[in-house]
Interface confidence: medium
């Protein structure tokens, strides 16, 4: 059963599935200037048996015959229904989630694919949210949404995620704006929101005690 609508929109956040339930479809979209080959599949489908799941069909893009390479690829009518898009890459994937029974891993890229993937999710699919670059999560807790069937209708649960962005106050001299990372988390592989080498915190103590307090500081 396909989910009727998109996962909820969270301000300054994007979502990604760690693994895809059997029945999920991924549109075969091509980047500008390319199109699907004539006999090519419209979509890839996650299928499987009790022990193994994989993507059926292959997406293939070829150079467009027309010279107008700025023309957007127009989706087929059946593709315009239930457009779920994701372009978020995340290093936070639980390693064992993608090997869940009845789930497919993220499909490998195909040549000249579009920058944004469009999925058609099924009931039971879980997606994970995280804040986009320059934003941070303000609360602990699971930032996930599940497509559920309730009273014959599908709905997505509401993820508990609030993203805040204060680039003016959190940007320090000599630092570049951060790249996308989980929940706006600083990453040393890219640039940092706050570098841990420069960032220091030090405790000082003042005691107002009726009893005595003896303190020593670790250096």
């Amino acid at each position: 059963e396909l989910c009727d609508d998109d996962p909820p929109e969270i301000p300054h956040a994007t979502f990604k599935a760690m693994a895809y339930k059997e029945g999920t479809m991924l549109n075969c979209e091509c980047k500008r200037g390319f199109r699907r080959i004539k006999s090519g599949s419209l979509y890839m489908l996650c299928t499987g048996n009790s022990s193994h799941s994989s993507w059926d069909n292959q997406c293939q893009c070829t150079s467009s015959a027309t010279r107008n390479t700025t023309k957007q690829v127009t989706p087929q009518p059946e593709e315009q229904k239930e457009r779920k898009t994701t372009e978020m890459q995340s290093p936070m994937q639980p390693v064992d989630q993608a090997s869940l029974p009845g789930h497919c891993r993220e499909p490998p890229p195909w040549e000249n694919e579009a920058t944004e993937r469009i999925y058609h999710f099924v009931v039971g699919q879980m997606v994970y949210y995280q804040c986009v670059q320059g934003y941070r999560a303000l609360h602990r807790g699971p930032a996930e949404s599940v497509c559920k069937m309730t009273h014959g209708k599908t709905r997505w649960t509401q993820p508990q995620l609030i993203c805040t962005g204060e680039m003016e106050t959190s940007q320090f001299p000599g630092e570049e704006k951060p790249q996308a990372s989980p929940e706006g988390r600083p990453e040393s592989e890219t640039s940092c929101l706050v570098t841990t080498t420069d960032f220091q915190i030090q405790t000082e103590m003042a005691a107002t005690m009726e009893t005595s307090i003896f303190t020593t500081e670790y250096q």
């Epitope: 936070m92 602990r140 996930e144 959190s170 706006g184 915190i201």
Partner: antibody, heavy 105, light 107 residues
Framework: PSGTLSLTCAVS?????????WSWVRQPPGKGLEWIGE???????NYNPSLKSRVTISVDKSKNQFSLKLSSVTAADTAVYYC???????????WGQGTTVTVSS | DVWMTQSPSSLSASVGDRVTITCRAS??????LNWYQQKPGKAPKLLIY???SLQSGVPSRFSGSGSGTDFTLTISSLQPEDFATYYC?????????FGQGTKVEIK
């Protein structure tokens, strides 16, 4: 003992008004780590329920520091107290050097 | 509160050994699990966040895995500087809670 413990954490190398929570964690001698509470620069706080009635955490943005007050201390509050930057779902990545507090009667 | 249980509480190993420490949560915490290393007289140091992501500057011999309730920290080849106490911490809910620690000693 019925005194109040006051600790201040000075933040350098960045603004305390950045999008971070700031936590206090303590460690009794020879024991594990216990989270005390945290504060956001707006003044929003979260406290450990086990200590909530005795804990106050505040922030002073002008001095780029945040503070812990623990009231009605006893010997059980003897510990090394750490302050840390808390990335919420992604752990505490920057820590203060720690201050040893000994409460004796 | 979510309770974290580490095992073993201590272990003896030699340089070059492969060391595995486990952490179990009292309820599912998805992948919101972090690992810290602490040496005597020093503050904890973040090693792994989100169950399996290596904190910047941490050697690649450290790795983390798991999801749900069961998690593992692995040191592929123990080095002299790795003898320390290791803590897991859940950040799924407030208050964040730590495991009781695993002390890695020289055999």
């Amino acid at each position: 003992p019925s005194g109040t413990l006051s600790l201040t954490c000075a933040v350098s190398g960045g603004s305390i008004s950045s999008s971070n929570w700031w936590s206090w964690v303590r460690q009794p001698p020879g024991k594990g780590l216990e989270w005390i509470g945290e504060i956001y620069h707006s003044g929003s706080t979260n406290y450990n329920p086990s200590l909530k009635s005795r804990v106050t955490i505040s922030v002073d943005k002008s001095k780029n520091q945040f503070s812990l007050k623990l009231s009605s201390v006893t010997a059980a509050d003897t510990a090394v107290y750490y302050c840390a930057r808390d990335l919420m779902n992604y752990g505490m990545d920057v820590w203060g050097q720690g201050t040893t507090v000994t409460v004796s009667s | 509160d979510v309770w974290m249980t580490q095992s073993p509480s201590s272990l003896s190993a030699s340089v070059g050994d492969r060391v595995t420490i486990t952490c179990r949560a009292s309820q599912s915490i998805s992948s919101y699990l972090n690992w810290y290393q602490q040496k005597p007289g020093k503050a904890p140091k973040l090693l792994i966040y989100a169950a399996s992501s290596l904190q910047s500057g941490v050697p690649s011999r450290f790795s983390g895995s798991g999801s749900g309730t069961d998690f593992t920290l692995t040191i592929s080849s123990l080095q002299p500087e790795d003898f320390a106490t290791y803590y897991c911490q859940q950040s799924y809910s407030t208050p964040p809670t730590f495991g009781q620690g695993t002390k890695v000693e020289i055999k």
